[in-house]
């Protein structure tokens, strides 16, 4: 018995039927990516983390979903206090507004 064709990774089971002269064979097949791997070819890596290399969870497609307070492609950039003037201030941890030299105030404005 042989079968040629694509079976994409998913949670559902796929039924394959084979009929011979004296027997009928039904197979239930499920292909699943290894943990932390995604996509049809299981080559997209996403492992949730919450440290200096990224603050994110992974959606069902393996895309990084930033945790509250973090942004950017790798979710490494902190979201500063709302209203912080980013021309004259910034932050390395969420919710702060640290002023550049020569600027002051709650929003560095």
């Amino acid at each position: 018995v042989s079968h040629a064709g694509m079976i994409n990774p998913e949670d559902r089971w796929k039924s394959l039927h084979f009929s011979g002269h004296v027997a009928h064979l039904e197979l239930q097949i499920r292909v699943r990516c290894d943990e932390n791997y995604y996509s049809a070819t299981c080559n997209k890596f996403c492992r949730p983390r919450n440290d200096f290399f990224g603050h994110y969870t992974c959606d069902q497609y393996g895309n990084k979903a930033c945790m509250d307070g973090w942004m950017g492609k790798e979710c490494k950039e902190a979201v500063c206090k709302q209203g912080c003037n980013l021309l004259h201030g910034g932050c390395t941890v969420p919710g702060e507004c640290r002023c550049s030299y020569g600027w002051q105030g709650r929003f560095c404005d």
Partner: antibody, heavy 123, light 107 residues
Amino acid sequence: EVQLVESGGGLVQPGGSLRLSCAASGFTFTSYDIHWVRQAPGKGLEWVGGISPADGDTDYANSVKGRFTISADTSKNTAYLQMNSLRAEDTAVYYCARNDYDVRFVGSGMDYWGQGTLVTVSS
Amino acid sequence: DIQMTQSPSSLSASVGDRVTITCRASQDVSTAVAWYQQKPGKAPKLLIYSASFLYSGVPSRFSGSGSGTDFTLTISSLQPEDFATYYCQQSFTAPPTFGQGTKVEIK
């Protein structure tokens, strides 16, 4: 048994280049970060940079940005630190370390370290 | 960058003593602090991660606590093999930064 083995250190002149290797074994290379940490003679620890071998994401300390490049060969389970435009202040023992993380915890920890390789920048 | 300031920079203690090392972050780092032990000529060893979790294989006399900006490493009963230098490290935001180290010497 988890092992990290550094190689490639030595004496180099200021402005020169050197490539360090970190050969990993005993664990799934793509499931962890590999970081480089250095220690100047008689001084403390300084993070140099790191890589996530699975996706190639890298980050660097400001002191080496633009001069050092970290890469990984997943077929060889090896990480590399390419050091260019070396300065006297880059003289240190360079360690590679595995960084383990778990989203249930805030932060991470470098749980396995290599033995270190000495890089001396001097004329 | 976030500064990690350890105190004291060195201390002398006897076997059996309770030893406390503190680490202060220049900004809030939640509980993202690890502690390492290093002996001369050797690589550092992880003791504590996420401020208070004991790493596998580390003796229970080591403990960590703290959150925000103030953190503590405690050795409840100092043993001969504990004489070493200890480093704290924040891993909350890039770049990860280490404290300057605390050398624990024999009194």
